[in-house]
Interface confidence: low
């Protein structure tokens, strides 16, 4: 059976439809209606109950960057809230609170950077205490043709319910006072997002008059954030007229929640930011709008912006890495909830702990660097996704290693050099997050030196030879010795050992061919020889 509009108005727990913001991937969002109680004669406290934010599913294609109207009829969004009675004007009979919202559910999700959460879809209103301790709301949420309703209970402040002395018996019927009739009246604000106006309906009152006009004709096309004071309301069944004040809320499509967490700090911080879109602060008094952000399970992480709406960032720092936080972000209008988002945010992977490397027993040109497998500490550090191992003598070389290795053989080293090895673990979260580098160092063993460079021979006299050379490119050891061997006809003649490469060989035979062999000795190893042939002259004397 298709419900008629009147059926819908009598329903107390209908799902509400609001204009939809751009579809986004599914996100943990929940919104509860605010409760705004409106009292007559300026003592109003209004309790709004906008409902649950829509969680859009990942397969949806994005909408254009504009507010997409609700499919729920007339491109409108209706809120429902009730005002509480003034303490001087109790409503006759009182009222009972509707059932609470059964088990609010949140859908796990994460927040892509700079993503707007659509403020959308009030679901069903619930009891909510406004600022006044005397506040009690009988909140009903109705699904009228245009969507959800924000019902404002608008008590009057003129006159108490009519009573007679106990001893008096009256047979005639007296009219109910309008203060009593309208003191507990429900006002449905219907938001027409197409033209950003509200319609206010006085619920369950037939032929309500606002002044001399039908309220139905007067209380529409209300501008958001406007207030209408001292509206004289009555109908045929009550007297005298009473007054009510209406405080029209801003459209919830004007608010969107964005993730503003810097990637670099996403492991220990959550940043959320309410932004407004097309909210005219000339007409909407920012003093009436404020917000609160609170993330559990932290106790003292709360941002509050009271009595002003500044679309600034609220960043909670010093949080635990890789931890699920439930963040409640609320927009308050006149001190009570207009929009509530409940979002599950997981902080990014923490900085991993780097194990201490051991540089092992080095050879001349390689060594094995090893380290223990990391022990994961869920409180802070995350298991590494990999390692970066760097080694340097003068210049540095680095190697990226997978997380399943615990050793690496460093090769192509230079003999007899001091090396420093640094190892750091990293995780790939929203950014690569590096742990603190741990170091070890080693000294490679000596190896054979290179040949000497630039060996030259010359004949200063007829029977003497000068031999000079430069040092090897790499000495590969601790000491510096130059060794000269002189040979002639394949036979050993003489040998010199000096710390510099400047040899003077004299008293040689005249007119004889000699072979000069120079090698370098580094105190551990001797290198290959460089050979030069030279002949002495005949004796000129």
């Amino acid at each position: 059976q298709t419900p008629t509009p009147s059926d819908e108005l009598s329903t107390t727990e209908n799902a509400l439809l609001l204009p939809q913001s751009d579809p986004l991937p599914a996100r943990t969002t929940e919104s509860t209606p605010p409760s705004i109680s409106e009292r007559g004669n300026g003592s109003s406290e209004t309790t709004y109950h906008p409902g649950v934010l829509s969680t859009l599913l990942p397969h949806l294609s994005p909408q254009p960057d504009s507010q997409t109207p609700s499919a729920g009829g007339a491109d409108t969004q209706t809120f429902s809230s009730q005002a509480d009675n003034p303490t001087l004007t109790p409503a006759p009979g009182g009222g009972t609170d509707p059932p609470g919202v059964p088990g609010e559910r949140t859908v796990p999700g994460t927040i892509p950077a700079d993503t707007a959460f659509p403020v959308d879809t009030p679901s069903l209103a619930r009891n909510s205490s406004a600022a006044s301790p005397t506040h009690t709301s009988n909140v009903s949420t109705t699904d009228i043709s245009s969507g959800a309703s924000l019902t404002t209970l608008t008590p009057s402040t003129l006159g108490l319910a009519s009573t007679d002395p106990p001893s008096t018996t009256i047979a005639t019927t007296t009219k109910q006072t309008c203060a009593a009739m309208f003191g507990n009246i429900t006002v449905n604000y219907t938001y027409e997002s197409s033209n950003q106006t509200f319609k206010a309906d006085l619920k369950d009152v037939q032929n309500a008059k606002c002044g001399n006009e039908d309220c139905e004709n007067v209380l529409n096309n209300l501008e958001e954030c406007s207030q209408i004071k001292n509206i004289s309301v009555s109908n045929d069944s009550c007297a005298p007229a009473t007054t009510i004040d209406l405080y029209v809320p801003p459209g919830t499509d004007k608010f969107s929640l964005h993730d503003c967490t810097p990637k670099e700090k996403a492991n220990t911080s959550i940043c959320l930011e309410w932004k407004t879109k097309n909210l005219d602060f000339r007409k909407c008094n920012s003093d009436n709008i404020s917000y609160v952000l609170h993330c559990e399970p932290e106790n003292n992480t709360k941002c509050i912006r009271r009595n002003t709406f500044i679309p600034e960032r609220c960043q909670l720092d010093n949080l635990r890495a890789q931890t699920n936080y439930t963040c409640v972000a609320e927009i308050l209008y006149r001190g009570v909830k207009l929009v509530k988002n409940v979002i599950n945010v997981q902080t990014d992977l923490g900085i991993p702990e780097t194990p201490k490397p051991s540089c092992g027993d080095p050879a001349a040109r390689k060594t094995l660097v090893s380290w223990p497998e990391p022990v994961s500490k869920p409180e802070s550090a995350s298991k590494p996704h990999g390692y970066v191992l760097c080694y340097k003598n003068n210049s540095e070389k680095c190697k990226s290693l997978p997380n399943n290795v615990t050793s690496f053989e460093v090769e192509s080293l230079k003999p007899y050099k001091y090396y420093e090895v640094s190892l750091l673990a990293y995780v790939n979260g929203k950014i690569q997050r590096n742990g603190t580098a741990e170091k070890c160092n080693f000294h490679t063993k000596a190896d054979r030196p290179d040949k000497v460079n630039g060996m030259k021979t010359s004949r200063p006299t007829d029977n003497s030879i000068n031999v000079t050379c430069g040092p090897p490119y790499e000495t590969n050891g601790p000491k510096t010795f130059y060794i000269l061997v002189v040979r002639s006809g394949g036979s050993f003649v003489t040998k010199y050992n000096k710390t510099n490469c400047q040899f003077y060989v004299d008293n040689l035979y005249y007119s004889t061919d000699y072979e000069f062999l120079v090698s370098f000795h580094n105190g551990v190893y001797e290198g290959d020889s460089v050979i030069r042939n030279e002949s002495t002259n005949f004796n000129a004397k």
């Epitope: 298709t2 419900p3 439809l17 649950v52 599913l57 499919a71 559910r105 949140t106 859908v107 043709s145």
Partner: nanobody, 118 residues
Amino acid sequence: QVQLVQSGGGLVQPGGSLRLSCAASGRAFNSAAMGWYRQAPGSQRELVASISAGTASYADAVKGRFTISRDYAKNIIYLQMNSLKPDDTAVYFCNYRTTYTSGYSEDYWGQGTQVTVS
């Protein structure tokens, strides 16, 4: 999951008529609101008509010319478009929205149907 399959659409002369249909499958949807949106080239998607709990509403531009109806038994909505104008040329999308008391809502969209009035 809800799947929406659209049909209808095509090329029609000004003043002519077309009927679009959108069949939802995968789940009963009597609690959902369904509607039609359209998007002309270079424009943003706009609501054309919607129907929820038996109550229909229309964008001003199509009032009196378009009629939205819904077959609850077959999970189908229809958009009867009469007196079509060139301004009605757009891709028409079927929309399905359910709002849940548990705290979130779901939107689903059809694949889109081209309507050209020329």
